[in-house]
């Protein structure tokens, strides 16, 4: 006959308050004759949780039918778990005897601990926007989890990031823990549509991690490039000048025209288009009346983007019969 082994497969069982916990125990032999009992703790002060032989245990039920002879499963379910139920539970075989049954063999024990799921991660970006090629910091926070062991990863557009620092508090024993992680992300010009993701994995989540996201569109400022051009064809006594503001983000933009240093209100038309990468283009047309115009007309397109210092581009207007020659220069 095979020597009796008491098998408790789980070293740790995480349970949630109010739920039912299943403590597993199987035996490899039915000998010696005698009952199987469950205890919490060890030594003289151990607490009887379930006795196959006798007693009333209203919160405990057996997983299998213990009246079946070939049953080797002595697992139990404990309902309505409370924080007072935490501890290490032992499945113990006794040999029938008098005046008391004699403890024969104990299982290795299963530690029951209260598991608390982490809160949904909250990702916060920088307070101010930053231009591409610079580094910005994102923080991720999740709270209220237990046990302390937790895994946090950062991703940018699905690619795992490595430049981050993570802290779990408190360092000592606690009912619940918090995690805070700061990731450093280098901004690319095309990051308007990018996302950073903070992923938290915890034993209570059963392999289904929680994710928090932040859009880099909240953190990036892509400054515009300006180009001012004179249209080659005259329309009567008017010349059409175009200011093209390209690849900027966010959309917030103020454009003003100046003629020989004097601010004009005569913007004829403008269009805003969105690029595939999420940046914008703005095109403004300005009609210059050249009927009484001298040769030295300088037009300036000035753009103030997202509250930053204005940038401008100048164009010296060439009024010739064929309007072939165009020249321009930029001033910051």
């Amino acid at each position: 006959e095979e020597e009796l082994q008491m098998i408790q497969p789980e070293k740790l069982l995480l349970v949630t308050v109010g739920k039912t916990a299943t403590l597993h125990c199987t035996v490899t032999s039915l000998l010696p004759v005698g009952p199987v009992l469950w205890f919490r703790g060890v030594g003289p002060g151990r607490e009887l949780i379930y006795n196959q032989k006798e007693g009333h245990f209203p919160r405990v039920t057996t997983v299998s039918d213990l009246t079946k002879r070939n049953n080797m499963d002595f697992s139990i379910r404990i309902s309505s778990i409370t924080p007072a139920d935490v501890g290490t539970y032992y499945c113990v075989k006794f040999r029938k005897g008098s005046p008391e049954d004699v403890e024969f063999k104990s299982g290795p024990g299963t530690e029951m601990a209260l598991g608390a799921k982490p809160s949904a991660p909250v990702v916060l970006g920088p307070a101010a926007r930053t231009t591409p090629e610079h580094t910005v910091s994102f923080t991720c926070e999740s709270h209220g989890f237990s046990p302390r062991d937790i895994t946090l990863k950062w991703f940018k557009n699905g690619n795992e990031l490595s430049d981050f620092q993570t802290n779990v508090d408190p360092t000592g024993q606690s009912v619940a823990y918090s995690i805070r992680s700061t990731a450093r992300v280098v901004l690319d010009p095309w990051d308007v549509r990018s996302q950073v993701i903070c992923e938290v994995a915890h034993v209570t989540l059963q392999g289904d991690p929680l994710r928090g996201t932040a859009n880099l569109s909240e953190a990036i400022r892509v400054p515009p490039t300006l180009e001012v051009t004179q249209q080659p064809m005259r329309v009567g006594n008017q010349v059409n000048v175009t200011c093209q503001v390209r690849k900027f983000y966010p959309q917030s933009l103020q454009l003003t025209w100046s003629e020989n240093g004097n601010v004009c209100q005569r913007e004829t038309a403008s269009t805003l288009t969105e690029n595939k990468d999420g940046t914008y283009n703005w095109t403004s047309w300005f009609l210059v009346n050249i009927s009484d115009q001298r040769d030295d007309v300088v037009l300036t397109c000035q753009v103030k983007h997202d509250g930053q210092l204005a940038v401008s581009k100048r164009l010296a207007l060439e009024v010739t019969v064929h309007q072939k020659d165009q020249s321009s220069d930029a001033t910051p």
Epitope: L30, P35, K53, K68, R69, G97, S98, E100
Partner: antibody, heavy 118, light 107 residues
Framework: EVQLVESGGGLVQPGGSLRLSCAAS????????MHWVRQATGKGLEWVSA???????YYTGSVKGRFTISRENAKNSLYLQMNSLRAGDTAVYYC????????????WGQGTMVTVSS | DIQMTQSPSSLSASVGDRVTITCRAS??????LAWFQQKPGKAPKSLIY???SLHSGVPSKFSGSGSGTDFTLTISSLQPEDFATYYC?????????FGQGTKLEIK
């Protein structure tokens, strides 16, 4: 249905032998401790012998060396070989199944009568 | 061997009565005590094991108690089918031994 049916009883002379059989149905006999209990006419119950699941055997003092308990798993049957029978062995012999974890008797056969008389 | 002593040896009672039979072991048997009911010409029937646990199908009017050396069987309200002989048995160690029986008769 769980059932035990004894057979093999009868009249035998003192010093003679008998082999009692117990056919089990509805369960696997080898998974249980099995017992023989006897009852003389008008008397109380007396435990006679047992065989454990591991094949270990036990006897009451008055039958030790004379009776042998055994089982045949293929036939799901229990036996009691009784030799050197005495008048004091006259009784109804019951085949009894021991309980699941503590060996408390739970299923009894209907009994078979053994009479030892010249 | 462990000696089992039942009392009384016989008992007369009426239908509806509550009766108690006691069983004493010569040494501590923990709670490995069983009770059986036997009617004339029939095999015994298992009623109670581990002193107080009812076998499947046994009506709840039967109850057992005790531990160590002193045990009782109580029948809460006697019915005609309950008049029989009752035996206690210790099964903590071999040889298993029975009490001499208590015959419950109709008054």
């Amino acid at each position: 249905e769980v059932q035990l049916v004894e057979s093999g009883g009868g009249l035998v002379q003192p010093g003679g032998s008998l082999r009692l059989s117990c056919a089990a149905s509805g369960f696997t006999l080898s998974s249980y401790d099995m017992h023989w209990v006897r009852q003389a006419t008008g008397k109380g119950l007396e435990w006679v012998s047992a065989i454990g699941t591991a094949g270990d055997t036990y006897y009451t003092g008055s039958v030790k060396g004379r009776f042998t308990i055994s089982r045949e798993n293929a036939k799901n049957s229990l036996y009691l070989q009784m030799n050197s029978l005495r008048a004091g062995d006259t009784a109804v012999y019951y085949c009894v199944r021991g309980g699941v974890w503590d060996d408390a008797f739970d299923i009894w056969g209907q009994g078979t009568m053994v009479t030892v008389s010249s | 061997d462990i000696q089992m002593t039942q009392s009384p040896s016989s008992l007369s009672a009426s239908v509806g009565d509550r009766v108690t039979i006691t069983c004493r072991a010569s040494q501590d048997i923990n709670n490995y005590l069983a009770w059986f009911q036997q009617k004339p010409g029939k095999a015994p029937k298992s009623l109670i094991y581990t002193a107080s646990s009812l076998h499947s199908g046994v009506p709840s009017k039967f109850s057992g108690s005790g531990s160590g050396t002193d045990f009782t069987l109580t029948i809460s309200s006697l019915q005609p089918e309950d008049f029989a002989t009752y035996y206690c048995q210790q099964y903590v160690s071999y040889p298993y031994t029975f009490g001499q029986g208590t015959k419950l008769e109709i008054k």
